[in-house]
């Protein structure tokens, strides 16, 4: 608020007020008499720049007049009273308010004194993010989108991630004039590393106490990746048995595990148990190489593996040992 | 209703003194500010000044400064201008007028200068 | 100070006729106008404040209008009993300054 004058009555109110999109508004405008000042009102006007004519006056014989009656009420002005307090309520914001609107009173003996005050009009935008299902494209792809629909002005939206990517980010008009929607792709290229990672989109506009922060999780669609545990290149003869593990991330999850080998068919020792395949003891040496094939519904991948089971004496800490 | 009820007309010998009242009914007498216009014959309106029955507070046209005083009796509800050292261009129809812009106005009195 | 310019100090009009009278302000005084009417031998009577607004009881067919330095009064559908001067007024600021008149004159 601008300071007030010294010796003479200055009027006070805020250089800019906001108001939303079809709600009311109060314009706020006092008149402030120095103490020892005396000052008589006989008029409060509002006048828009740009526009000829008064929108609203209050007069001390004739009360109040409007332009747009239903839309303005003088919210303390009353006849019989001193003249103070020229604030003025619009009702039904529409975006052709927005703009610079002058406050004047008629006083004796100073003279007219006036303020102008800028009305903004905005609208709150709502705000919406969602993942970008994406498959293994090896280019650039929209994994997330996050969109501010119906603000004014339009919304200033950022991406927070520790992966990297790209925004792009484009304005439509909304569905109410005046108003933008604001659409904004967080793009990266796709990999298996990225699958339900968290990337944040963050919304700031003049309308929010604070930005809005929304988290989007990321899916990639990708084959399995096979890989084969268990085995320490450690087994020997007569030892008890052992299980190796077929590990496979995959989105979506696995559908099947198929274990086999390099000539065929498992062997009688081994015995497929879903992703788990059991080695049971053997009494001759083995030199096997292993094949666990996973499917899910974007394919099927798989791992190899070559098991030795070697003669020797087994040790303490060997990877198959007796009962 | 509101009224104002100005005193008859005057001649005047140049370099003499007149003082004009208005008095108001139908209003709270310190409600409305009140002004004095002339207006010489056949000629344009000229603000002399106005004032406030409230406090007293006065505002002269610079032109007027000197020539007019303007007073009030709240008691009587009564406005007052005193025109002085008057010469044949003092001669005119004064009005006073109440209210910003000027809504009620009185019937005018007809102040004649002369020898 | 503010100087009130009416440039036509005579118009001419017939009954049921629409006229103007214009009047320009030195400088901007916003809609700090009025207009008044005199009819001859009578006290100005006041029908327009802030440049466009009626006081209550002045015929519909007066129409005020304009803001910053330029102010028109109309009337349309003019009467007999319109024969009158015609005098704007601004009063944004000391002193108040009135024009210099326009007298309506009727056919």
């Known amino acids: 608020w601008p300071p007030p004058g010294t010796g003479d009555v200055v009027v006070q109110a805020p250089t800019q007020v906001p108001g939303f999109l079809g709600d009311s508004v109060t314009l706020p405008c006092y008149l402030q008499v120095p103490n020892m000042e005396v000052t008589h009102v006989s008029q409060l006007t509002w006048a828009r720049h740009g526009e000829s004519g008064s929108m609203a006056v209050f007069h001390q014989t004739q009360g109040p007049s409007y332009s747009e009656s239903k839309r303005l009420e003088f919210v303390a002005a009353r006849l019989g009273a001193e003249l103070r307090n020229a604030s003025l309520r619009m009702f039904g914001l529409r975006v052709e308010d927005e703009g610079n609107y002058t406050c004047l009173f008629v006083t004796f003996p100073q003279g007219s004194r006036s303020v102008d005050i800028w009305l903004r009009v905005l609208a709150k935008p709502q705000n919406t993010a969602e993942v970008q299902k994406v498959q293994l494209t090896g280019e650039p792809v929209p994994m997330a989108r996050c969109v501010s629909t119906g603000g004014r002005p339009p919304a200033q939206i950022t991406w927070h991630s520790d992966l990297g990517g790209m925004p792009n980010t484009s304005q439509v008009p909304g569905f109410l004039s005046g108003t933008v929607t604001v659409t904004s792709l967080w793009i990266l290229v796709p990999s298996s590393q990225v699958d339900g990672k968290n990337v944040t989109c963050k919304v700031e506009h003049e309308s929010f106490e604070k930005p809005q922060l929304l988290t989007v999780n990321l899916t990639v669609y990708y084959p399995p990746e096979v890989s084969i545990s268990g085995y320490d290149n450690n087994w020997y003869l007569g030892q008890n048995e052992a299980t190796l593990t077929c590990d496979a991330r995959s989105n979506p999850e696995p559908t099947g595990y198929n274990w086999s080998t390099t000539m065929g068919p498992l062997p009688p020792f081994a015995v497929a148990q879903g992703a788990q395949l059991l080695i049971r003891p053997v009494d001759k040496p083995i030199n096997t190489t292993l094949i666990c094939n996973v499917t899910n519904a974007l394919g099927a991948r798989q791992a190899e593996l070559t098991v030795q089971v070697k003669e020797g004496p087994p040790s303490e800490h060997s990877g198959i040992s007796r009962n | 209703e509101v009224q104002l009820q100005q005193s008859g007309p005057e001649l005047v010998k140049p370099g003499a003194s007149v003082k004009i009242s208005c008095k108001t009914s139908g209003y709270t007498f310190t409600e409305y500010t009140m002004h004095w216009v002339k207006q010489s014959h056949g000629e344009s309106l000229e603000w002399i000044g106005g004032i406030d029955p409230n406090n007293g507070g006065t505002n002269y046209n610079q032109n007027f400064k000197g020539k007019a005083t303007l007073t009030v009796d709240k008691s009587s509800s009564t406005a007052y201008m005193e025109l002085r050292s008057l010469t044949s261009e003092d001669s005119a129809v004064y009005y006073c007028?109440?209210?910003?812009?000027?809504?009620?106005w009185g019937q005018g009195t007809s102040v004649t200068v002369s020898s | 100070d503010i100087v009130m310019t009416q440039s036509q100090k005579f118009m001419s009009t017939s009954v049921g006729d629409r006229v103007s009278v214009t009047c320009k302000a030195s400088?901007?005084?916003?809609?700090?106008v009025a207009w008044y009417q005199q009819k001859p031998g009578q006290s100005p009577k006041a029908l327009i404040y802030s440049a466009s607004y009626r006081y209550r009881g002045v015929p519909d067919r007066f129409t005020g209008s304009g803001s910053g330095t330029d102010f028109t009064l109309t009337i349309s559908n003019v009467q007999s009993e319109d024969l009158a001067d015609y005098f704007c007024q601004q009063y944004n600021s000391y002193p108040l300054a009135f024009g210099s008149g326009t007298k309506l004159e009727i056919k």
């Open positions: 007028a109440g209210v910003i812009p000027l809504e009620y």
């Open positions: 400088q901007n005084v916003y809609t700090n």
